[in-house]
């Protein structure tokens, strides 16, 4: 065959899309149907991933790269390389063993996946609740109650004026 043989490992001459046939003086055999080798020098081809059921094909398998799957509408990927598909829920819900359940009072979820999280406790930062939380949205914290006393401004006060004759440092 027309390829320079390597002195170290003759199999290293076999490109992706082939496997090294050790039984026949390191001839490179094309990968059989529905299999691939994504790197050179491989001694076997791997079976292509099949995107079936709730999985759908995002990228077709080729003799040089595996198929890539994502999830059918209503589901989202979990795990490396989308190894699992998990059911979507609505915003304001979380997935439990019994299906999608509304977030409990005091918690929210603004996505179709994941768990309900507690509303932010504005008072921990010395602030007040400006907008109440819902199942879908966190609370919006505003200025601290002291900042809202009569005559107080919520706008940052201007910096004190410099004395005449002094230039900035």
């Amino acid at each position: 065959f027309e390829r320079t043989r390597s002195l170290q490992d003759p199999c290293s001459n076999c490109p992706a899309g082939t496997f090294c046939d050790n039984n026949r003086n390191q001839i490179c055999s094309p990968c059989p149907p529905n299999s691939f080798s994504s790197a050179g020098g491989q001694r076997t081809c791997d079976i292509c991933r099949q995107c079936k059921g709730v999985f759908r094909t995002r990228k077709e398998c080729s003799s040089t790269s595996n198929a890539e799957c994502d999830c059918t509408p209503g589901f989202h990927c979990l795990g490396a390389g989308c190894s699992m598909c998990e059911q979507d829920c609505k915003q304001g819900q979380e997935l439990t063993k019994k299906g999608c359940k509304d977030c409990c009072f005091g918690t929210f979820n603004d996505q179709k996946r994941g768990i309900c999280r507690p509303w932010t406790n504005c008072s921990l930062d010395g602030k007040s609740v400006l907008v109440n939380g819902t199942k879908e949205r966190d609370v919006v914290c505003g200025p601290s109650p002291a900042d809202l006393s009569p005559g107080a401004s919520s706008v940052t006060p201007p910096a004190p004026a410099r004395e005449p004759g002094h230039s900035p440092q």
């Epitope: 065959f1 027309e2 390829r3 001459n13 992706a16 026949r24 055999s29 080729s62 003799s63 040089t64």
Partner: antibody
Framework: QVQLVESGGDVVQPGRSLRLSCTAS????????MHWVRQAPGKGLEWVTF????????YYADSVKGRFTISRDNSKNTLYLQMNSLRAEDTAIFYC???????WGQGTLVTVSS | DIQMTQSPSSLSASVGDRVTITCRAS??????LNWYQQKPGKAPKLLIY???SLQSGVPSRFSGSGSGTDFTLTISSLQPEDFATYYC??????????FGQGTRLEIK
């Protein structure tokens, strides 16, 4: 959908040359090795040559070694077969096929006759 | 090179019949065997790969079995469109790719 279209077949005299082309569409051509397979009139299938996805590895059947050259241009999604010193026994329909042999072109007829 | 031998070389059958074609390899090829169907004036079409896996879009009346040196292609209930020539091909020790000589399936 996957499509392979061969062209370049013709009637030629023994000893002459011919170049066949195979244009691919509907898949990532540069990710697949490619074959040429031929079929003499009324006969079975005979594998001719294979080229890896990147053009680095080629292999030929003994019957065409030294006379035929396989090549590809991935930027044009095209596979080629340069056939020199043609003989009467090269008369056949030539098919290109993906390395898995799962998709084939419709074939192009090469007739070698004086 | 591995030689592939098909039998019979031709056979006649009727619509609805169950038909079996066999393919024998000159040495063990594990399950690296593919089956093709070819109709006159058309390119071959992959039916079965890896001895028993049905190619996408192929009707389920086609099935394959076997491993090592002996393989079979079975059509459970012949349809009019199944009359064609069938080839086996090994992808265990290639190149060269080697095909069987073909089995011509004709209407009785």
């Amino acid at each position: 959908q996957v499509q392979l279209v061969e062209s370049g077949g013709d009637v030629v005299q023994p000893g002459r040359s011919l170049r066949l082309s195979c244009t691919a569409s509907g898949f990532t051509f540069s990710s697949f090795g490619m074959h040429w397979v031929r079929q003499a009139p009324g006969k079975g299938l005979e594998w001719v040559t294979f080229l890896s996805y990147d053009g680095s590895y080629k292999y030929y059947a003994d019957s065409v070694k030294g006379r035929f050259t396989i090549s590809r241009d991935n930027s044009k999604n095209t596979l080629y077969l340069q056939m020199n010193s043609l003989r009467a026994e090269d008369t056949a329909i030539f098919y290109c096929a993906r390395d898995w042999l799962d998709y084939w072109g419709q074939g192009t007829l090469v007739t070698v006759s004086s | 090179d591995i030689q592939m031998t098909q039998s019979p070389s031709s056979l006649s059958a009727s619509v609805g019949d169950r038909v079996t074609i066999t393919c024998r390899a000159s040495q063990s090829i594990s399950s690296y065997l593919n089956w093709y169907q070819q109709k006159p004036g058309k390119a071959p079409k992959l039916l079965i790969y890896a001895a028993s896996s049905l190619q996408s879009g192929v009707p389920s009346r086609f099935s394959g079995s076997g491993s090592g040196t002996d393989f079979t292609l079975t059509i459970s209930s012949l349809q009019p469109e199944d009359f064609a020539t069938y080839y086996c091909q090994q992808s265990y020790s290639t190149p060269p790719i080697t095909f069987g000589q073909g089995t011509r399936l004709e209407i009785k």
